[in-house]
């Protein structure tokens, strides 16, 4: 059973399909979620949709074997299995591991620490979003790109505002939050 990985954003419509053509003159085609929960079965020229959480929001294309699912949610995370009963009576199967992710919310930047140290401004900022598994990247006048939820930096005396942007992203979306400081060490705006 070949396994394909798919990551999609929640609320979207998804097409689960295989990249190869179906066996010729197959007898039966069934889509399952997990190992043995039937979603839809095509047999003798008819599609039967089973009582499941997908009923009413799935459609099968018997030509290609594609399964269309509308408005996917995180609860739809699963391994989907398409099993085809070939004319010789043996089955062939393909697996698609579907990961549904919510779009990331806009991050909130919090000042964890701010103090004057020898005319310099020491800053510790944290980029916060509720309980998500995401990637963080800080942008601004920084010695190097920081990929962490916390930014620690020291500002030398400066004339203009300095702004720092935190970008949070997962594989389906990204959002930015920005915080600016006026000299010497004053939070200006976000």
């Amino acid at each position: 059973g070949r396994l394909v990985h798919m990551t999609v954003v929640s609320g979207s419509n998804v097409t689960l399909n295989i990249s190869e053509s179906l066996p010729e003159n197959y007898k039966q085609l069934t889509w399952f979620y997990t190992f043995d929960q039937k979603i839809v079965e095509w047999d003798s020229g008819k599609s039967k949709y089973f009582e499941s959480k997908f009923k009413g929001r799935v459609r099968l294309d018997p030509q290609s074997g594609a399964l269309y699912i509308s408005k996917v949610q995180k609860e739809d995370n699963s391994t989907y299995v398409m099993r085809v009963l070939k004319k010789d009576g043996y089955e062939q199967e393909w697996k698609i591991k579907l990961q549904v992710l919510d779009p990331v919310p806009k991050p909130v930047i919090k000042i964890e620490k701010r103090e004057d140290v020898d005319d310099n401004c020491y800053l510790k900022l944290s980029c916060v979003i509720p309980g998500e598994s995401v990637n963080y990247t800080w942008y601004g006048e920084l010695p190097k790109e920081i990929q962490n939820s916390v930014l620690e930096t020291t500002l030398k005396p400066h004339k203009h505002s300095r702004c720092y942007t935190c970008q949070v992203s997962n594989s389906v979306s990204s959002k930015n939050g920005t915080f600016c400081f006026s000299p010497p060490c004053t939070a200006a705006r976000s």
Partner: antibody, heavy 118, light 108 residues
Framework: EGQLLESGGGLAQPGGSLRLSCAAS????????MSWVRQAPGKGLEWVSL????????YHADSVKGRFTISRDNSKNTLYLQMNSLRAEDTAVYYC???????????WGQGTLVTVSS | EIVLTQSPGTLSLSPGERATLSCRAS???????LAWYQQKPGQAPRLLIY???SRATDIPDRFSGSGSGTDFTLTISRLEPEDFAVYYC?????????FGQGTKVEIK
């Protein structure tokens, strides 16, 4: 009418291993999903492991996940259950059965007894 | 997971009598996907009924299944001596598949 015959049961120490086999005859074995179902002495039935006809996907009960592995060799018409890290509570008669259309279990083998004890 | 509760635990009847076995599910079994098995001492289970009411191959017509939703019944219209055994229900409407704990039909 197909027949299923289990073997490989016996006495094992806690933490030990056993490998059960189920030989199929009278059926085109590769066309069927298969299962292992167990029955502890004097108790009810509990499915243990499932495998698709092609062997491409498997499914295990939480109670055995990470310890038991189901597999099949369609060229030999044989189903296997590799049982590792055995516990006293794995003591049972183990049946293999055809997992008919991924729904019910029919027919069944006669069973093989696995006893886990020190 | 769906929990199946069978009642009574033991049914004491005489040959020729009618046996009524109950299987109750903790939540609705979709499409009435329920099977019944018979198991005699020292033997493997045997499929009797699938889809709540369809008799399996070679099962005598004194065995019948009925019910829907959460309540299912296996009826043996006239008990024959070979019918004294333990009976199990099993649902296949949702994963994981589950069995009831069994009902023993014994000779009174």
């Amino acid at each position: 009418e197909g027949q299923l015959l289990e073997s490989g049961g016996g006495l094992a120490q806690p933490g030990g291993s056993l490998r059960l086999s189920c030989a199929a005859s009278g059926i085109t074995f590769g066309r069927y999903a298969m299962s292992w179902v167990r029955q502890a002495p004097g108790k009810g039935l509990e499915w243990v492991s499932l495998i698709s006809g092609s062997g491409g996907s498997t499914y295990h009960a939480d109670s055995v996940k990470g310890r038991f592995t189901i597999s099949r060799d369609n060229s030999k018409n044989t189903l296997y259950l590799q049982m590792n890290s055995l516990r006293a509570e794995d003591t049972a008669v183990y049946y293999c059965a055809i997992y008919n259309n991924y729904n019910w279990f029919d027919p069944w083998g006669q069973g093989t007894l696995v006893t886990v004890s020190s | 997971e769906i929990v199946l509760t069978q009642s009574p635990g033991t049914l004491s009847l005489s040959p020729g009598e009618r046996a009524t076995l109950s299987c109750r599910a903790s939540q609705s079994v979709s499409s009435n996907y329920l099977a019944w098995y018979q198991q005699k001492p020292g033997q493997a289970p045997r499929l009797l009924i699938y889809d709540a009411s369809s008799r399996a191959t070679d099962i005598p017509d004194r065995f019948s299944g009925s019910g829907s939703g959460t309540d299912f019944t296996l009826t043996i219209s006239r008990l024959e001596p070979e019918d004294f055994a333990v009976y199990y229900c099993q649902q296949y409407g949702s994963s994981p598949r589950t069995f009831g704990q069994g009902t023993k039909v014994e000779i009174k």
